[in-house]
């Protein structure tokens, strides 16, 4: 038969950061290829990554159509060299993925401090707003556009001469903090979605930026 000696995929795993979403699976193919299908709970199946020898498939284009929907994918296994034939009725072996809701489950990418500016005893720290592949009216949306006030940034800031980290929070991408005059400070930010309860609640910390380096500006 057309699907003899093919092995069903297993360990189907969603890898998603800032909505860039890839489905990964095993095993590495030996004399077989894969095709992926994706659908919403109520929608039709759409095929992607036709007859690929890869063990991953970028599904970003599909999930960004509605990031609040829940998606299911499945991976079909075919013999290597398989050509679709209209007469074939035998369904190839396949495995279903876990359900995936991008809005709830995509990981938050590492944020970046765009700039900081000191005016007297105040410092304005700006977090770079990352672009995503989510679109609205043919315009790409930023992370802030997608998550709105659900996305919080926590700023950690400390005197270069000390270890204790003060914190500030914002539901925009800007912080305005009080600092001691004549002191140099370092900054790091973390993205948080407080409504989440799992591992994807927080991003990794941004690279540390310190006053006296090129990102900063100081005015009396």
């Amino acid at each position: 038969s057309g699907t003899t000696n093919t092995v069903a995929a297993y360990n189907l795993t969603w890898k998603s950061t800032n909505f860039k979403t890839i489905l990964e699976w095993e095993p590495k193919p030996i004399n077989q290829v894969y095709t992926v299908q994706i659908s919403t709970k109520s929608g039709d199946w759409k095929s992607k990554c036709f007859y690929t020898a890869d063990t991953e498939c970028d599904l970003t284009d599909e999930i960004v159509k509605d990031v609040k929907q829940t998606y299911l994918a499945r991976v079909f296994s075919y013999p290597a060299g398989h050509v679709e034939s209209t007469g074939s009725t035998e369904e190839p072996p396949y495995e279903n993925s876990p359900e995936f809701t991008p809005y709830l489950e995509t990981n938050l990418g590492q944020p970046t401090i765009q700039s900081f500016e000191q005016v007297g005893t105040k410092v304005n720290v700006t977090v770079q707003d990352e672009w995503t592949l989510v679109r609205r009216n043919d315009t790409f949306l930023s992370l802030r556009d997608v998550f709105g006030k659900d996305l919080i940034y926590t700023l950690y800031y400390w005197k270069s001469s000390s270890s204790g980290k003060k914190t500030a929070k914002t539901n925009t991408n800007e912080f305005l903090i009080d600092v001691d005059k004549g002191e140099n400070y370092c900054f790091s930010v973390q993205a948080v979605i407080p409504s989440r309860r799992t591992a994807n609640r927080k991003s990794t910390d941004s690279p540390v930026e310190c006053m006296g380096h090129e990102k900063g500006e100081s005015r009396e």
């Epitope: 919080i152 950690y156 204790g164 980290k165 903090i177 790091s188």
Partner: antibody, heavy 120, light 107 residues
Framework: EVQLVESGGGLVQPGGSLRLSCAAS????????IHWVRQAPGKGLEWVGY????????YYADSVKGRFTISADTSKNTAYLQMNSLRAEDTAVYYC?????????????WGQGTLVTVSS | DIQMTQSPSSLSASVGDRVTITCRAS??????VAWYQQKPGKAPKLLIY???FLYSGVPSRFSGSRSGTDFTLTISSLQPEDFATYYC?????????FGQGTKVEIK
């Protein structure tokens, strides 16, 4: 069910040391911030310090800076308060509390507290 | 550090009374204020967060409001289980600071 359980309190002499534990269940401490708060007998609440277990960042109240150290072991889902050079004025019930890291960061869950008595 | 000045330090009231407790922040704290209830020998419990949001499971007779740097906790109709000490707390900046507490006693 979210729970925080403190342990390790007791009677200690001035100048002595004590390590308090805060064991969390029902959530993973690495995704939150953990604070220590104390309450002297008949007095109000005093914030002691915090740790973000995801990066190890800490900050302390001036009254304990240099004497107390907060740490966390994410594999044990437990935070710790190491108290050195204890003074009579450190006598209090010590609570750990979870900070949900939202914009207003309320302490949404608290432990039952553990009593530390510093006396000779 | 930001000071949270809470008043009154104690009050006597009867079941059914409307009770108001206020907290004044020494500088702007936006809405980053929470209110807690504490009973003797027990840990504090969160009542109100973000100045005016009722925490899950808290009876609707509790409410919070903000006017500039003044924050108010109101109990619309005091119940027997509400006799306790109440604390405000700001978490706008580190260190977070508490008010001195208000003990609500039975008249």
């Amino acid at each position: 069910e979210v729970q925080l359980v403190e342990s390790g309190g007791g009677l200690v002499q001035p100048g002595g040391s004590l390590r308090l534990s805060c064991a969390a269940s029902g959530f993973t401490i690495a995704y939150y911030i953990i604070h220590w708060v104390r309450q002297a007998p008949g007095k109000g609440l005093e914030w002691v310090g915090y740790i973000d277990p995801s990066n190890g960042y800490t900050y302390y109240a001036d009254s304990v800076k240099g004497r107390f150290t907060i740490s966390a072991d994410t594999s044990k889902n437990t935070a710790y308060l190491q108290m050195n050079s204890l003074r009579a004025e450190d006598t209090a019930v010590y609570y750990c509390a979870r900070d949900d890291q939202s914009l207003s960061s309320p302490f949404d869950y608290w432990g039952q507290g553990t009593l530390v008595t510093v006396s000779s | 550090d930001i000071q949270m000045t809470q008043s009154p330090s104690s009050l006597s009231a009867s079941v059914g009374d409307r009770v108001t407790i206020t907290c004044r922040a020494s500088q702007d704290v936006n809405t980053a204020v929470a209110w807690y209830q504490q009973k003797p020998g027990k840990a504090p419990k969160l009542l109100i967060y973000s100045a005016s949001f009722l925490y899950s499971g808290v009876p609707s007779r509790f409410s919070g409001s903000r006017s500039g740097t003044d924050f108010t906790l109101t109990i619309s109709s005091l119940q027997p289980e509400d006799f306790a000490t109440y604390y405000c707390q700001q978490h706008y900046t580190t260190p977070p600071t508490f008010g001195q507490g208000t003990k609500v006693e039975i008249k």
